[in-house]
């Protein structure tokens, strides 16, 4: 079975890398715009140049092609806690992260929201934070992690998952309290 | 105590519209971002859309973009999602919640109200 192609991509095959065919004649290939430029007029013949102007500030293309806007430049979400890493150039979006000491969460694909690395208090770190996830902690023994934090097993309640990691606590308690009284 | 009360919900056919309605108190809704997610049958919830606390920065997901309208009316402590062109796939539990703070999990969401889109 042949793959089934968009007409631009049908298009685009019939011509040389770095070439697009013309969408008025399709015996002419034109040369594609380069990256930070956006398709002005096609060219007017074979071995003619395309007409490729700069994008204008707030738009970019980021790589070779035959589109006739350039995109727009995303704003980085201050909502979300998102800062700014580099800005917008003619031929690269803007680039958005988070503060020192924060990671990305993904909600979707293209929706992240920075959040401050836990400090495993009351645990140790077991694997330290980075860009896209947050410190896996271990917890001191006493302790039960929730929401990623070190809580005392004294918050465990018997319908919470924690009474798996508490029980042996508790049975320790009770075991301490039994050898006393012989 | 945050309460947030969604309102709205019905069974809708397929291109039709709905309007929800979350009704907040308990916290200062002027200084929160909001938040509508969704939860289809059998599914994880998903990320809908959301509004900054003055109601200028908004953001939709692929799947409700140019359908869906998020608004709030800061006066009435009142969030809105006006969904247009429904669709089968938007059937779902809609929950408004505010945006979290402390890690990627809501402590703050309310009950939802189920939208059925069928024809």
């Known amino acids: 079975l042949v793959p089934h192609l968009g007409d631009r991509e049908k298009r685009d095959s019939v011509c040389p890398q770095g070439k697009y065919i013309h969408p008025q004649n399709n015996s002419i290939c034109c040369t594609k715009c380069h990256k930070g430029t956006y398709l002005y007029n096609d060219c007017p013949g074979p071995g003619q140049d395309t007409d490729c102007r700069e994008c204008e500030s707030g738009s970019f293309t980021a790589s070779e092609n035959h589109l006739r806007h350039c995109l727009s430049c995303s704003k980085c979400r201050k909502e979300m806690g998102q800062v700014e890493i580099s800005s917008c150039t003619v031929d690269r979006d803007t680039v958005c992260g988070c503060r020192k000491n924060q990671y990305r969460h993904y909600w979707s694909e293209n929706l992240f929201q920075c959040f401050n690395c836990s400090l495993c208090l009351n645990g140790t770190v077991h694997l330290s934070c980075q860009e896209k996830q947050n410190t896996v902690c271990t917890c001191h023994a006493g302790f039960f992690l929730r929401e990623n934090e070190c809580v005392s097993c004294s918050n465990c309640k018997k319908s919470l998952e924690c009474t798996k990691l508490c029980l042996p606590q508790i049975e320790n308690v009770k075991g301490t309290e039994d050898s006393g009284t012989t | 105590e945050v309460q947030l009360l969604e309102s709205g919900g019905g069974l809708i056919q397929p291109g039709g519209s709905l309007r929800l309605s979350c009704a907040a108190s308990?916290?200062?809704?002027?200084?929160?971002?909001m938040v509508w997610v969704r939860q289809a049958p059998g599914k994880g919830l998903e990320w809908v859309s959301h509004?900054?606390?003055?109601?200028?920065?908004?953001y939709y997901a692929d799947s409700v973009k140019g359908r869906f309208t998020i608004s709030r009316d800061n006066s009435k402590n009142t969030l809105y999602l006006q969904m247009n062109s429904l669709r089968a796939e938007d059937t779902a539990v809609y929950y408004c919640?505010?945006?979290?703070?402390?890690?990627?999990?809501?402590?703050?969401r309310g009950q939802g109200t189920l939208v059925t889109v069928s024809s």
């Open positions: 919640a505010l945006l979290p703070k402390r890690g990627p999990w809501f402590d703050y």
């Open positions: 308990g916290f200062t809704f002027t200084k929160e971002t």
């Open positions: 509004i900054d606390r003055v109601g200028q920065d908004t």
